[in-house]
C-alpha cells in the first residue's frame, strides 16, 4: 500500500574538523521510494557538486573535505507524492585548530610612543591569544595589554620593552605559534654630561667634555660661536650606547661652544644641545671694556618693528657694527618670507629686538636682552612649526651660511621677567589686527573668546615639543 514518507532518523548536529569528512544521515520509510533533496542554509545542494557525495538513495550526505565556510544548517526533504513532503534539519559546526592569519612583524619604535604588534587568529572554538617575550610568557600591566583582536599594545614604550616577541593562539584542538619578531626601541638623543664653562688665562689649553646617549648612538658635533669648530682636536669614544666627545682648545679669544648630539629615526633627526662659555680672565682690560655702543637705529629692515628713534646696541666685535648687524637681520629676514602669517610678525619682532638689542646708555653701554617669556611665546606659540623646520635645516646643513644661528636667540639663556622686569625687553608686536590674518589657525575644539595662534597639538606630524627637538 502507498505510504507517506516518515523520517525515522532526524538529522543531528555534526561537529567536524577542517579537511575532514562530515556525514548527515536522513533515514526515510515510505512507499513508493521517495525523492530526497538536500539544502544548506535553504540553498539546494546540486547532485553533481563534487564537494559532496549523496548515497543510499539520497539518505546519506557526505561533505568530502570540510572547509570553515561549510558551517550552517543542513536539511533533507523527502517526497513520494503520497501525503506531504517531510523535512529534518541539523547543524554542521566546523571545528578548527588555531591559525594565525595576520602574524606580528618586526617593529622599530621611538621610546615613549605606542607600539602595536598584530596577531589576528582564526579557529573554532575561538582561540585565546597570549604572547611570549624572549623565553617567558609576557605579563600584562598598565602599559602592556593583549587586545580583543589578539594584538599586543604597548603604551609609552620603554627601552626594556625591546626584544623578541611571538604570539601563541590556543584552543581545545591545538596551538599555533607565530614566527619570532623583533621590537626595537629607538631613543632620542640626550646629553648626559654637558660641557662646563671655564674662565681661563689667555693661551691656556681647555678640554670640553660632552657625553650623550640615544638609540641609535648619536653623533656629536661642536659649534664655536655659531660656526663649525675650526681649530682644536676632537677625541671620541663609544661604549654601551654612550658617546663621549672631548674637544681640546688653545684659548686665544672668548667663545660660546655648543655640543650638539644628533641621531636619526627613519627620515627624522633628534638633537640635544648643551653649551659652555669660555671667558678669558684678563680679557676685560679698560681699553677692551666697551664691547659696543648705543646709537639710534638708522637701518631699513627693522624700521617697522623697532620704536621710532630707538636706541640700539651696536657690537664693536664687528668691524662695521651697523652694516654687519643689518646684514645679519637681512639674511634672516629673507628666510621669513615663506613662514605663516601668524609666525612672521612675531619672528620679525624677535629677530630685530635680538640683533638690535635695546641699549642702556651709561659709562658702559649695555644691551638689554629680550625677556625669556617673549622668546618662548614666539618659539612655541607663534612659530612652533617654523622653528622646527629651521632646526631640521640646521641639522642637514641646508643653510648657505651659519649666520642665521646668530640671529635666533636661545630662549633659556635669556633673563626672565620674574628676575627683574627692567632687566629685559618686552616685544610690543605680539598682538595682531584680525584683518591682517585671513588664515588664522583654529584653537582646540574648545574655542576661547580670543583670537590666538594655535598651540602645537598632538595631531601635528611635524611638531613635537620633546627632547627630539630640544628647543631651549
Amino acid at each position: 500500500l502507498p505510504k507517506a514518507p516518515v523520517i525515522t532518523t532526524p538529522l543531528e548536529t555534526v561537529d567536524a574538523l577542517v579537511e575532514e569528512v562530515a556525514t548527515f544521515m536522513c533515514a526515510v520509510e515510505s512507499y513508493p521510494q521517495p525523492e530526497i533533496s538536500w539544502t544548506r542554509n535553504k540553498i539546494l545542494i546540486k547532485l553533481f557538486d563534487t564537494r559532496y557525495s549523496i548515497r543510499e538513495n539520497g539518505q546519506l550526505l557526505t561533505i568530502l573535505s570540510v572547509e570553515d565556510s561549510d558551517d550552517g544548517i543542513y536539511c533533507c526533504t523527502a517526497n513520494n507524492g503520497v501525503g506531504g513532503a517531510v523535512e529534518s534539519c541539523g547543524a554542521l559546526q566546523v571545528k578548527m585548530k588555531p591559525k594565525i592569519t595576520r602574524p606580528p612583524i618586526n617593529v622599530k619604535i621611538i621610546e615613549g610612543l605606542k607600539a602595536v604588534l598584530p596577531c589576528t587568529t582564526m579557529g573554532n572554538p575561538k582561540p585565546s591569544v597570549s604572547w611570549i617575550k624572549g623565553d617567558s610568557p609576557l605579563r600584562e600591566n598598565s602599559r602592556i595589554a593583549v587586545l580583543e583582536s589578539g594584538s599586543l599594545r604597548i603604551h609609552n614604550v620603554q627601552k626594556e620593552d625591546a626584544g623578541q616577541y611571538r604570539c601563541v593562539a590556543k584552543n581545545s584542538l591545538g596551538t599555533a605559534y607565530s614566527k619570532v619578531v623583533k621590537l626595537e626601541v629607538e631613543v632620542f638623543a640626550r646629553i648626559l654630561r654637558a660641557p662646563e664653562s671655564h674662565n681661563v688665562t689667555f693661551g691656556s689649553f681647555v678640554t670640553l667634555h660632552c657625553t650623550a646617549t640615544g638609540i641609535p648612538v648619536p653623533t656629536i658635533t661642536w659649534i664655536e660661536n655659531g660656526n663649525a669648530v675650526s681649530s682644536g682636536s676632537i677625541q671620541e669614544s663609544v661604549k654601551d650606547r654612550v658617546i663621549d666627545s672631548r674637544l681640546q682648545l688653545f684659548i686665544t679669544k672668548p667663545g660660546l661652544y655648543t655640543c650638539i648630539a644628533t641621531n636619526k629615526h627613519g627620515e627624522k633627526f633628534s638633537t640635544a644641545k648643551a653649551a659652555a662659555t669660555i671667558s678669558i680672565a684678563e680679557w676685560s682690560k679698560p681699553q677692551k671694556d666697551n664691547k659696543g655702543y648705543c646709537a639710534q637705529y638708522r637701518g631699513e629692515v627693522c624700521n617697522a618693528v623697532l620704536a621710532k628713534d630707538a636706541l640700539v646696541f651696536l657690537n664693536t666685535s664687528y668691524a662695521d657694527p651697523e652694516e654687519a648687524q643689518e646684514l645679519l637681520v637681512h639674511t634672516a629676514w629673507n628666510e621669513l618670507k615663506v613662514v605663516s602669517p601668524v609666525c612672521r610678525p612675531a619672528a620679525e619682532a624677535l629677530l630685530c629686538n635680538h640683533i638690535f638689542q635695546e641699549c642702556s646708555p651709561g659709562v658702559v653701554p649695555t644691551p638689554i636682552p629680550i625677556c625669556r617669556e617673549y622668546c618662548l611665546a614666539v618659539k612655541e606659540l607663534f612659530c612652533a612649526k617654523e622653528w622646527l623646520v629651521m632646526e631640521e635645516k640646521t641639522h642637514r646643513g641646508l643653510y648657505r651660511s651659519e649666520m642665521h644661528l646668530l640671529s635666533v636667540p636661545e630662549c633659556s639663556k635669556l633673563p626672565s621677567m620674574h628676575w627683574d622686569p627692567t632687566a629685559c625687553a618686552r616685544l610690543p608686536h605680539l598682538d595682531y589686527n584680525k584683518e591682517n590674518l585671513k588664515t588664522f589657525p583654529p584653537m582646540t575644539s574648545s574655542k576661547p573668546s580670543v583670537d590666538i595662534p594655535n598651540l602645537p597639538s598632538s595631531s601635528s606630524s611635524s611638531f613635537s615639543v620633546s627632547p627630539t627637538y630640544s628647543m631651549t
Partner: antibody
Framework: EVQLVESGGGLVQPGGSLRLSCAAS????????IHWVRQAPGKGLEWVAS????????SYADSVKGRFTISADTSKNTAYLQMNSLRAEDTAVYYC?????????????????WGQGTLVTVSS | DIQMTQSPSSLSASVGDRVTITCRAS??????VAWYQQKPGKAPKLLIY???SLYSGVPSRFSGSRSGTDFTLTISSLQPEDFATYYC?????????FGQGTKVEIK
C-alpha cells in the same frame, strides 16, 4: 607690596547670581593678566576664567562658558567675576590670581600672587 | 582639551627623602608649565614656572624638568615644611588646566 583681595562670596540659591571682586594693589591690572581659579571642598584646583585688560581679551573654562563673565575696571584696579545661573557644582572657594605680561607670555610666568579666596555656596 | 595627568595622587615620605612628582600632558604642549604648593586652608604658592625656572624665594631643593610631554617636580631633600599638596598647571594661550594634585604626607 603686591596684594589681591577677593570679596562678594556667600550663599546663593541654584539659578541665582553673584558678583565677585578682586581688588589689586602693588601693581596695575592693566599691565598684567588676572585669573579666577576655584577649589571645591576637598577637591583640586580648577581654572575658571582669565582677562588681559591691555588687549581686552578674555577666556573661559567650558564648565562656565556662557554663565560667567570676567571683567576689569582699570581705574579701580579691580577685576570682577559675574556668575549667573549658578549650580550646586559651582560651590567652591574662588581665588583670584595674577600673572605678569599679556596673554601670550602670562602662561610662562605662572600665577605668582594669589588672593586669600572667597567661599561661594550654591544650595537651596 | 589638553589634560594634565598627575602622578602619584599621594605619597608618604620621610624628612630627607628625594621626592618626584610627574605630570603628563595628553598632547604636545609648550613649556608654559608651572608647579604650585598648597597647604590646607591656604592659597597655592608658585614654585616653578616655564617648566624648569625656580621662582624667587623658593628653596633650591625644588626643581622642575621636562622630557617631551612629561613634566617633573623634584624635591631633592624633603623638609618638614614641604608636607603639602602639589599641583602642576599647563597654560595654552589661556586654555589652562591643572593636574589633579599630589598629596605629600609624612611616613
Amino acid at each position: 607690596e603686591v596684594q589681591l583681595v577677593e570679596s562678594g562670596g556667600g550663599l546663593v540659591q541654584p539659578g541665582g547670581s553673584l558678583r565677585l571682586s578682586c581688588a589689586a594693589s602693588g601693581f596695575t591690572v592693566s599691565s598684567s593678566s588676572i585669573h579666577w581659579v576655584r577649589q571645591a571642598p576637598g577637591k583640586g584646583l580648577e581654572w575658571v576664567a582669565s582677562i588681559s585688560s591691555s588687549y581686552g581679551s578674555t577666556s573661559y573654562a567650558d564648565s562656565v562658558k556662557g554663565r560667567f563673565t570676567i571683567s576689569a575696571d582699570t581705574s579701580k584696579n579691580t577685576a570682577y567675576l559675574q556668575m549667573n545661573s549658578l549650580r550646586a557644582e559651582d560651590t567652591a572657594v574662588y581665588y583670584c590670581a595674577r600673572s605678569e605680561g599679556d596673554r601670550y607670555v602670562s602662561g610662562y610666568m605662572g600665577f605668582d600672587y594669589w588672593g586669600q579666596g572667597t567661599l561661594v555656596t550654591v544650595s537651596s | 582639551d589638553i589634560q594634565m595627568t598627575q602622578s602619584p595622587s599621594s605619597l608618604s615620605a620621610s624628612v630627607g627623602d628625594r621626592v618626584t612628582i610627574t605630570c603628563r600632558a595628553s598632547q604636545s604642549v609648550s613649556s608654559a608649565v608651572a608647579w604650585y604648593q598648597q597647604k590646607p586652608g591656604k592659597a597655592p604658592k608658585l614654585l616653578i614656572y616655564s617648566a624648569s625656572s625656580l621662582y624667587s624665594g623658593v628653596p633650591s631643593r625644588f626643581s622642575g624638568s621636562r622630557s617631551g610631554t612629561d613634566f617633573t617636580l623634584t624635591i631633592s631633600s624633603l623638609q618638614p615644611e614641604d608636607f603639602a599638596t602639589y599641583y602642576c598647571q599647563q597654560s595654552g594661550v589661556w586654555l589652562i588646566t591643572f593636574g589633579q594634585g599630589t598629596k605629600v604626607e609624612i611616613k
